[in-house]
């Protein structure tokens, strides 16, 4: 769609005559008829296929034609077309004399024609005017013409419709060829896609206007390149949305379970070594001289009452020292210089000689203890209840009230680990945070008290004559209990038969 524009500039008819040569009376009142048609090698009469237009009377005889376009007048003349401009044309311009006011063809005598010019040629669409002048014997016409596209039509032949736009179906202006020129910040075939903030993640971000970066669900950050971890994730990260990958030392669905309590809380005191043993649990290995769950207690080596037979304990820098009562000696006052003849057993304790009278042992009545039955049993003073159990005196007996998670007479068994009695040879089982520990009786060792360590003096069957052999664990010696009729440290002599000596 476009417009052929014809600008009439000057018409000269000095003699004021018609084409026939006859003069106009009083002068030639001149108007023009214009016919625009398809290209013809020889311009001939016929339909004005591209359009036709007429002017009012513009002047008499010779005159200049005023440019009236600014005032909305008829110069230049407009011949609109609603097709693709072919690039070629034929143009006929006729000058007519109007004797009266009626300018219709049928109202004019045929000899009212002043002049007729016909041209044809090529004409490209453009803003520039082509100036032309046509002269006949009696007249001269100066004019210019051009073809321009109608509003919103573009291209070499005005065939491309383009309407500038700034809504969600496009943000563009039109180039001279009719192609779209996107407004800043927009892209796409129809400039309907905003250019997001530079660096905005292609998949995880989007925008509805330029320089914006809106995040899709599960993503965050200025460029939507940071995933959002699982809601409640404490000490973790993600590589895809809603993940919770735990930082080192943390565990659980939300990474809120402390697997490295040692590093995060440093619970062990006094230079102890800390070992993680599960979620929020740890074990402290104390340096010598310290005790307690966190090795927070300074150890007095006398606390374990190492002195026997009433010996008193004295702390020293490098350990302890037992002061023994009369009749006892040894590191722990464990050796006696007394025998049953000295009646060493108090409180009705009965004395048993051992090692052929070189030693003795007291058998204490109920409620008394000590190697000489000298101590009245306060069943709770020895703190028999393990693992924080509470000791309750019940007359001649006592009982332990255990903390949750522990059982056994002395609360010595952890419900879970010690329930299956893992300690052999009467070993005492202690449940620890990270497993269990067996306290072995004398003569046994190993993680489960499975290794016999003392030499069983009876193992070589030293007693004769079906005597019963007893091992003294404190001295690794044996005692033979002779049947009737036999005597001797090994029951090797029948009664009445003195030993035969070699001399």
């Amino acid at each position: 769609s476009g417009v052929f524009q014809l600008q009439l500039q000057e018409f000269i008819n000095e003699r004021g005559v018609l084409a026939s040569g006859r003069p106009c009376e009083p002068g030639c009142r001149t108007f023009f008829r214009v016919c625009l048609k398809h290209f013809q090698a020889v311009v001939s009469p016929g339909p004005c296929t591209f359009g036709t237009v007429s002017t009012p009377v513009l002047g008499t005889n010779s005159f200049a034609v005023r440019d009236d376009s600014s005032g909305g007048g008829r110069n230049p003349l407009q011949l609109p077309f609603n097709f693709t401009w072919p690039g070629t044309f034929s143009l006929i311009i006729e000058a007519w004399h109007a004797p009266g006011d009626d300018l219709r063809p049928e109202a004019l005598p045929p000899d009212a024609l002043i002049s007729k010019i016909a041209i044809q040629g090529s004409l490209a669409v453009g803003q520039n005017w082509l100036l032309d002048e046509q002269t006949s014997t009696l007249t001269r016409l100066r004019y210019s013409y051009r073809v321009i596209c109608s509003d919103n039509y573009y291209g070499d032949n005005c065939s491309r419709l383009c309407k500038k736009r700034n809504d969600h179906f496009g943000h563009y202006v039109c180039q001279p060829d009719g192609n779209l020129s996107c407004l800043p910040g927009w892209t796409g075939e129809y400039c309907q896609q905003p250019i997001c903030l530079s660096g905005c993640h292609e998949q995880n971000g989007y925008c509805s206007k330029p320089a914006e970066c809106l995040c899709r669900p599960g993503w965050q950050g200025r460029l939507c390149n940071e995933c959002i971890p699982h809601n409640g994730c404490r000490h973790g990260t993600c590589s895809t949305p809603w993940q919770c990958t735990c930082d080192e030392g943390w565990g659980g669905l939300f990474c809120d379970q402390d697997l490295n309590y040692c590093t995060h809380h440093s619970p062990c005191k006094n230079g102890a070594t800390c070992s993680n043993s599960g979620q929020r649990s740890y074990t402290c290995t104390c340096r010598p001289g310290y005790t307690g769950v966190d090795c927070e207690l300074e150890l007095s080596e006398c606390d374990s009452n190492p002195c026997r037979n009433g010996g008193s304990c004295k702390d020293q820098e490098d350990g302890y020292h037992c002061l023994c009562p009369p009749g006892y000696y040894g590191l722990h006052c464990e050796h006696s210089t007394l025998s049953c003849a000295d009646s060493p057993c108090f409180n009705g304790g009965s004395c048993r000689e051992r090692n052929q009278g070189a030693n003795y042992a007291c058998e204490c009545p109920p409620n008394f203890t000590g190697s000489n039955c000298e101590k009245k049993v306060d069943r709770c003073t020895s703190n028999p209840c393990a693992n924080g159990g509470q000791c309750l005196n019940r007359g001649p007996s006592r009982m332990c009230r255990c903390r949750p998670g522990f059982t056994g007479t002395y609360c010595e068994l952890h419900v879970s680990d010690c329930a299956r009695n893992p300690c052999a040879h009467g070993g005492t089982c202690h449940d620890l945070e990270n497993g269990l520990m067996c306290t072995c009786p004398a003569g046994f060792s190993g993680r489960r008290c499975e290794v016999r360590t003392s030499i069983d003096a009876c193992a070589s069957s030293p007693c004769f004559n079906r005597a019963t052999c007893y091992t003294d664990l404190s001295t690794d010696t044996f005692v033979c209990n002779c049947p009737y009729g036999f005597v001797g440290s090994r029951c090797e002599f029948p009664v009445g038969l003195p030993p035969s000596f070699p001399w």
């Epitope: 419709l161 809504d167 179906f169 496009g170 075939e189 129809y190 309907q192 989007y206 925008c207 509805s208």
Partner: antibody, heavy 121, light 107 residues
């Protein structure tokens, strides 16, 4: 062949709300060439544009309805939705969903069959 | 608020006659006009887009133009199946606007 199917119409009390769905088949709702719109038509009256949405979630609304309308999209279900609140009798209409084509300069080349919403007590 | 006004509201035409419906709006020629045909109890159907283009399947008797303040839908030789209500539509900024409709009836 692209098809749009509306659902969710029916009788609604004045002051209530409606949620209509438009399921798209035969083409992806995530194409950059289309907006997805809602248009309504009161009984015996003309067409009124309600609003539209792009697959990214960008929305545009008729200023006269904007305060009561929300359009959303679920690309995984290839569907988009119209939520309208504070309904009154004059909201009684057949509600259509349509595809608005950027290449057709915003012309709607595919329409749903429409779903009737009646606002009455 | 942008308004599109169609004229006439109603037209009764004999078959083979030419039908012209005008849609007027301020500087409508600077916008793209679309035309929809709606038959009773049916969804609207696009018959003209981008002022004058026809979607495939729309008969060539339908044509459109748009310049100045007016867009025009022309049905060159009306057929019985063309009885319907016709709506013009354009976009003003980001809002879709429809004309009030023109009902075309067969005499």
């Amino acid at each position: 062949e692209v098809q749009l199917v509306e659902s969710g119409g029916g009788l609604v009390q004045p002051g209530g709300s409606l949620r209509l769905s438009c399921a798209v088949s035969g083409g992806s709702i995530s194409s950059s060439s289309y907006y997805w719109g809602w248009i309504r038509q009161a009984p015996g009256k003309g067409l009124e544009w309600i609003g539209d949405i792009y697959y990214t979630g960008s929305t545009y609304y008729n200023p006269s309805l904007k305060s009561r309308v929300t359009i959303s999209v679920d690309t995984s279900k290839n569907s988009f939705y119209l939520q309208m609140n504070s309904l009154r009798a004059e909201d009684t209409a057949v509600y259509y969903c349509a595809r608005e084509d950027v290449i057709l300069r915003g012309g709607s080349d595919y329409w749903g069959q429409g779903t009737l919403v009646t606002v009455s007590s | 608020e942008y308004v599109l006004t169609q004229s006439p509201d109603f037209q009764s035409v004999t078959p083979k006659e030419k039908v012209t419906i005008t849609c007027s709006g301020q500087r409508l020629g600077d916008k793209y006009a679309s035309w929809y045909q709606q038959k009773p109890d049916q969804s609207p159907k696009l018959v003209i887009y981008e002022d004058s283009k026809r979607p495939s399947g729309v008969p060539s008797r339908f044509s459109g133009s748009n310049s100045g303040d007016d867009a025009t839908l022309t049905i060159n030789s009306l057929e019985a199946e063309d009885a319907a209500t016709y709506y013009c539509q354009a976009w003003d900024r980001d809002t879709g606007v429809f004309g009030q409709g023109t009902k075309v009836e067969i005499k």
